[in-house]
């Protein structure tokens, strides 16, 4: 029986050009984590294999950094990075646990963004 739960950073926002850390944490299970895959929609960004370590997709190697821990750091964010991200924990003997994070990349800085909506 799968007893574990995944906690994630949930819905997060970041500034264009900046960076963000995507974090998931698997708890309430003694299952062994054999691999964690990070995906954006159906595109594989990175793999952290318990035996062989981190592997970053060649398509993202300039903008994705491993860690901290089993998390993933996205750099040089663009508006196109807005969307759903999934951490997929492959475990034994439980099976697969999936966490979801929604990232919104804001076009303008927080200051500009705030100024645009200030009450006259």
């Amino acid at each position: 029986m799968m007893t574990g739960t995944i906690e994630t950073t949930g819905n997060i926002s970041a500034e264009k050009g900046g960076s963000i850390i995507l974090q998931c944490h698997l708890s309430s299970t003694t299952a062994q984590v054999t691999q964690v895959n990070w995906e954006q929609q159906d595109q594989l960004l990175a793999i952290c294999n318990a035996d062989l370590g981190w592997h970053i997709s060649p398509s993202f190697k300039d903008r994705v950094a491993p860690g901290p821990g089993l998390g993933l750091t996205l750099q040089s964010l663009t508006v196109n990075d807005t969307g759903e991200y999934f951490c997929i924990y492959h475990t034994y003997p439980d099976g697969t646990y999936t966490g979801r994070i929604f990232l919104e990349v804001l076009e303008s800085s927080v200051a500009e963004h705030g100024a645009r909506f200030q009450i006259p």
Partner: antibody
């Protein structure tokens, strides 16, 4: 050209060990994973494990953990697979195959010719 | 582990006809799927990787499609040398990398 050449056929008794070699040539040996896959007579393909020839890191299928050891000798561009406590069900052709670059993942694009291991009393 | 299921187990086709082989993964493997051909007494040979990219030297009559959990290998016009066993394999989660049980393409 890129190739993997394996050692010759072996006949072993139950309980013994076997060590199969796989010599790589024609490419940068440390840059690509090497996998081991076996095939029992008339059966399908079964993945045994993988080794990173650069770092020596390994990952084994749970079924073989404790019985299989994969090593490499970078000076001769050779990978070894040792299987211990042999039983009759281990009778199979054992293949080494080159996987993706060690920085990412990939299919098995180059295969050795296979080594027949027969376990019989 | 990810279970790969191939169908049919055996496919009887006449030379010149089209053959369609299916492979299903128990969970998404994105496009990290390969197809191999194996003839009796020989090592497997890589045909398709990335679900749809032909390996070096593979004729254009072989094509792969699909993504996620459903994949297809199509041989547009079977030649005599194409009668063999075909395996699919996922290479995104290990251990273990997993193969399908194979589809034998035989002469009708």
């Amino acid at each position: 050209q890129v190739q993997l050449v394996q050692s010759g056929a072996e006949v072993k008794k139950p309980g013994a060990s076997v060590k199969v070699s796989c010599k790589a040539s024609g490419y940068t040996f440390p840059a690509y994973y090497i996998h081991w896959v076996r095939q029992a007579p008339g059966q399908g393909l079964e993945w045994m494990g993988i080794i990173n020839p650069s770092l020596g890191l390994t990952s084994y299928a749970r079924k073989f953990q404790g019985r299989v050891t994969m090593t490499r000798d970078t000076s001769t561009s050779t990978v070894y697979m040792e299987l211990s406590s042999l039983r009759s069900e281990d009778t199979a052709v054992y293949y080494c195959a080159r996987g993706g670059r060690t920085t990412w993942i990939g299919a098995l694009d180059i295969w050795g010719q296979g080594t027949m291991v027969t376990v019989s009393s | 582990e990810i279970v790969m299921t191939q169908s049919p187990a055996t496919l009887s086709v006449s030379p010149g006809e089209r053959a369609t082989l299916s492979c299903r993964a128990s969970q998404s493997v994105s496009s990290n799927l390969a197809w191999y051909q194996q003839k009796p007494g020989q090592a497997p040979r890589l045909l398709i990787y990335g679900a749809s990219t032909r390996a070096t030297g593979i004729p254009a009559r072989f094509s792969g499609s699909g993504s996620g959990t459903e994949f297809t290998l199509t041989i547009s016009s079977l030649q005599s040398e194409d009668f063999a066993v075909y395996y699919c394999q996922q290479y995104v989660v290990w251990p273990p990398l997993t193969f399908g049980g194979g589809t034998k393409v035989e002469i009708k």
